[in-house]
């Protein structure tokens, strides 16, 4: 299993939307991809979950564009606020 986030950093103005890309490899038949936000304290905050057999997930300002064939799961954060400045991680799980 493997997860790759190619963007090391992104800069965006407030009020816009940003897309964070994540590519993965897995041999699992059924799985979930999770997006987390890491606070300066290093605490990880769960944002949204995408199931391998589910429609694109959406929760508040977070939405996922899931392309199963391309093994791509992009997180879009809309209506950006200063508090969104952070490190974002995607994770793969069964």
């Amino acid at each position: 299993q493997k997860v790759t986030q190619a963007q090391s950093s992104v800069s965006m103005p407030v009020r816009k939307a940003v897309t964070l890309n994540c590519l993965y490899e897995t041999s699992w038949w059924s799985y979930y991809i999770f997006w987390y936000k890491q606070l300066p304290s290093k605490e990880m905050i769960f944002l949204i979950r995408q199931g391998s057999d589910e429609q694109n997930a959406k929760s508040g300002r977070y939405s996922v564009n899931f392309k199963k064939a391309a093994k791509s799961v992009a997180l879009t954060i809309s209506a950006l606020q200063l508090e969104d400045s952070a490190k974002y991680f995607c994770a793969l799980g069964e």
Partner: antibody
Framework: DVQLQESGPGMVKPSQSLSLTCTVT?????????WHWIRHFPGNKLEWMAY???????DYNPSLKSRISVTHDTSKNLFFLNLTSVTTEDTATYYC??????????WGQGTLVTVSA | NIVLTQSPASLAVSLGQRATISCRAS??????????MHWYQQKPGQPPKLLIY???NLESGVPARFSGSGSRTDFTLTIDPVESDDAATYYC?????????FGSGTKLEIK
Amino acid sequence: DVQLQESGPGMVKPSQSLSLTCTVTGYSITGGYDWHWIRHFPGNKLEWMAYISYSGSTDYNPSLKSRISVTHDTSKNLFFLNLTSVTTEDTATYYCAREGGRGFAYWGQGTLVTVSA
Amino acid sequence: NIVLTQSPASLAVSLGQRATISCRASESVDGYGNSFMHWYQQKPGQPPKLLIYLASNLESGVPARFSGSGSRTDFTLTIDPVESDDAATYYCQQNNEDPFTFGSGTKLEIK
């Protein structure tokens, strides 16, 4: 879920002002998005008119700037459109919508406004 | 103002076939690594419905038959395969630069 609903007069006389209200339920208008007015003309043209942000800042289409204002009432979760000196060219269906950098995901059902003597 | 030119103005596509709609911007709508172009479907008496955001992202709840592609000034909405419920007018819209602008619309008829 987020819902928007436009209200106002269906008929306005030329040279008068048009005032519309957008009632937002399911989300606070101070919660981080921008709140827009868009109109749809009979010939199928869509025109963005203006927005008011969650913080109260506004931006207007330059083609309407001299005639338009948008305000909000955060205590009632409403925002408003005022368009002055209307003509028959302002006859359209008026929509309010929410936007946060990735398109207008939420719209009201629209209200038809006819400008006629 | 950024002008969005849609083509064709109308098209008729047989059930089960592919429909392709083009949107060309008078200047680039790319910024900060995103293409700020979106696609909507509108049926008579209804507000526009967001289908695709940021050029290629499928809005939640929209069938995977809809897809978007493109960057800078040239964008495409593809519906494959077309179903009878897809008869509607489709619009592109940019929000890279104020004032936000919409395309002139493409009316899709299903044969």
